[in-house]
Interface confidence: medium
């Protein structure tokens, strides 16, 4: 079955049910219901789940049993529309019930929340997941689901339940492990960084998709594609972006059903036809369904062919140009965008994507021209300067994680952002430039054929946390202008932003500089995140503060952590010496 | 729906010429690599001749120098001229939509058109 075939199924629920399997079936509607209906106990979430399954079964039975041709955003927004406390625990969502399809799942969907109001997730000790595990599997791993899903509203759910089998195999590894905990917690660890960097590079396509439109994110898969796939001709490059244009588009709408099952299809087909696609395959497509599907998303790049000849001689040379480009300009920019991401597995696919524009917006103006040629001759000109700016950046930024590591230059960007955006809150500025500094352990140690595709393409993941999380509260025009002008350029959007000279600083509240002992229980992370915090808020009093005056204060406090925590009355001595810290800072930055 | 309907074929002396057109319509005609592929009577399939999206080209050996394939985008048209004709040319000429050329693979076929050489 081809991802676009459809037959003519009498049932949709009954056809989703056959095709993905109670299990999947019942994982998959969980997932949904909880990125929905975020707040929703566990316990109401399963009884929902349980309802539809039930429904569906009817169904397998009999298609033309009663509701069963109605379509799933019918059956699953009625289901959701069940919920007692529906007005009391969401507010406003509770007004999209009163809607019809599709404005009701539209309606719920834009009240998905980026940044729930959820307690943080807390481990507790191996042993008590170890017999919460054994004593009912069934639960435990629909709880993981749940958490998971309730937090990430937009995680790509076929992967989720790629991650959920990774984690039930964990389990079955670790509990019967002499060290229990030696061999759980590296693997549970592994799991939430990935997690955490799966939703987000999902986010990402669903805005996309969602703020860009469909031909945005088409130009992405298609550079992306191209250099993974340099071998595969144009046509199936083609083919292979419709089809996953498609599955996102499902994921992101939240028909997750329908998404699983197309993904599968997909995996299929490039399984079935990776002779004409890439080298890379065959060992991705020898595992079973998730791992394959996991396995082909993050392939390596093939090698490129040895034959290809010089762009220009199509592109630039070629009197046809400006006729090939009227003729389809989408399909003549998309062969444009092919043929120059496969030659360049070194350019990230934003800078690939800002080539494609600039080369669009020449054709534009020289194709009107009287001597179009002329007019668009040196066009492959204009790109070296759009080149070399990321280049020199991550240049630059490297050599300064190199010099003081990744708390250090963590810190460096903290002061650099809050200074460009001061109005943004300091969580979020504290998760966002933390993320934005991993970029050097993550990234400055590839050769530089690999430095710019990481960076770059890991800063537009971050910098669209970023810009979701603002969208939330808007308080920025300078966020909103860099998150919604231009995909491609946000980043450089960002790096020109200077110091907001508007701006102006915040009052001094000793508060928010009063630490307790609890600090000396954290652990490294969670002590480096209050210490971070603690270095906004200072940028946000002092925005004019230099580099010099920020390190003195911070070498100060953190002593004054390492004293207290070392005292044997440690409350005390934080109430003392803090005040003397504070004191101490004012005077040093003259606040 | 995708359809390829080929002409041009007919009876003709060895070292004489011939141009084959093909009508391509239901798909984007240009955003894909086109090829004439021919079988001989009683033999199988045997590729002749590939063009780009873009206009390279590419030849069977067999018939470097002699055939010209070409492209009309503008009329959702594919050609090939054949030059110095031999009889081991004869053979129903398809025109095909290329999905894949490495290997080769058509997804789309005409119902052919054919040339004979022969004096």
């Known amino acids: 079955r081809g991802v676009f075939r459809r037959d003519a199924h009498k049932s949709e629920v009954a056809h989703r049910f056959k095709d993905l399997g109670e299990e999947n079936f019942k994982a998959l509607v969980l997932i949904a219901f909880a990125q929905y209906l975020q707040q929703c106990p566990f316990e109401d979430h399963v009884k929902l789940v349980n309802e539809v399954t039930e429904f569906a079964k009817t169904c397998v039975a009999d298609e033309s049993a009663e509701n069963c041709d109605k379509s799933l955003h019918t059956l699953f927004g009625d289901k959701l529309c069940t919920v007692a406390t529906l007005r009391e625990t969401y507010g406003e969502m509770a007004d999209c019930c009163a809607k019809q399809e599709p404005e009701r799942n539209e309606c719920f969907l834009q009240h998905k929340d980026d940044n729930p109001n959820l307690p943080r997730l807390v481990r507790p000790e191996v042993d008590v997941m170890c017999t919460a595990f054994h004593d009912n599997e069934e639960t435990f791993l629909k709880k993981y689901l749940y958490e998971i899903a309730r937090r990430h509203p937009y995680f790509y759910a076929p992967e989720l339940l790629f991650f959920a089998k990774r984690y039930k195999a964990a389990f079955t590894e670790c509990c019967q492990a002499a060290d229990k905990a030696a061999c759980l917690l590296p693997k549970l660890d592994e799991l939430r960084d990935e997690g955490k960097a799966s939703s987000a590079k999902q986010r990402l396509k669903c805005a996309s998709l969602q703020k860009f439109g469909e031909r945005a994110f088409k130009a992405w898969a298609v550079a992306r594609l191209s250099q993974r796939f340099p071998k595969a001709e144009f046509a199936e490059v083609s083919k292979l972006v419709t089809d996953l244009t498609k599955v996102h588009t499902e994921c992101c709408h939240g028909d997750l059903l329908e998404c699983a099952d197309d993904r599968a299809d997909l995996a299929k087909y490039i399984c079935e036809n990776q002779d004409s696609i890439s080298s890379k395959l065959k060992e991705c497509c020898e595992k079973p369904l998730l791992e394959k599907s996991h396995c082909i998303a993050e392939v390596e790049n093939d090698e490129m062919p040895a034959d290809l000849p010089s762009l220009a001689a199509d592109f630039v040379e070629s009197k046809d140009v400006c006729k090939n480009y009227a003729e389809a300009k989408d399909v003549f920019l998309g062969m444009f965008l092919y043929e120059y991401a496969r030659r360049h597995p070194d350019y990230s696919v934003v800078l690939l994507l800002r080539l494609a524009k600039t080369y669009e917006t020449t054709l534009e103006k020289c194709c009107a021209a009287a001597d179009p040629h002329e007019c668009y001759a040196k066009v492959f000109d204009e790109f070296k300067p759009l080149v070399e700016e990321p280049q020199n950046l991550i240049k630059q930024n490297c050599e300064l994680f190199e010099q003081l590591g990744e708390y250090k230059f963590q810190n460096a960007l903290l002061v650099r952002y809050t200074k460009k955006v001061p109005q943004v809150s300091t969580p979020t500025l504290v998760e966002v430039s933390r993320n934005l500094g991993k970029v050097g352990s993550k990234c400055c140690k590839h050769p530089e054929a690999k430095r710019m595709p990481c960076a770059e393409d890991y800063l537009s993941v971050v910098l669209n946390q970023l810009c979701v999380l603002h969208e939330k509260t808007p308080v920025s025009d300078r966020v909103t202008k860099c998150c919604t002008e231009s995909l491609v350029n946000r980043r450089p959007c960002f790096s020109a932003l200077e110091v907001d000279e508007t701006y102006v600083p915040k009052e001094f509240n000793a508060e928010t500089f009063t630490f307790h002992a609890d600090i000396c229980t954290l652990s490294e992370k969670e002590r480096q995140i209050k210490k971070q915090t603690a270095l906004v808020e200072l940028v946000k009093h002092k925005p004019k503060a230099t580099k010099e005056q920020l390190k003195a204060v911070m070498d100060d406090f953190a002593a004054f952590v390492e004293k207290c925590c070392k005292a044997d009355d440690k409350e005390t001595c934080f109430a003392e010496e803090g005040k003397k810290l504070v004191a101490a800072s004012q005077a040093a930055l003259g606040l | 729906e995708v359809q390829l309907l080929e002409s041009g074929g007919g009876l003709v002396q060895p070292g004489g010429s011939l141009r084959l057109s093909c009508a391509a319509s239901g798909f984007t005609f240009m955003a894909y690599q086109m090829a004439w592929v021919r079988q001989a009577p009683g033999k199988g399939l045997e590729w002749v001749s590939t063009?780009?999206?873009?206009?390279?080209?590419y030849y069977a050996d067999s018939v470097k120098g002699r055939f010209t394939i070409s492209r009309d985008n503008s009329k959702n048209t594919l050609y090939l001229q054949m030059n110095s004709l031999r009889a081991e040319d004869t053979a129903v000429y398809y025109c095909a939509k290329v999905r894949s050329m490495r290997p080769y693979k058509f997804d789309y076929w005409g119902q052919g058109t054919l040339v004979t050489v022969s004096s």
């Open positions: 063009i780009h999206q873009t206009g390279f080209t």
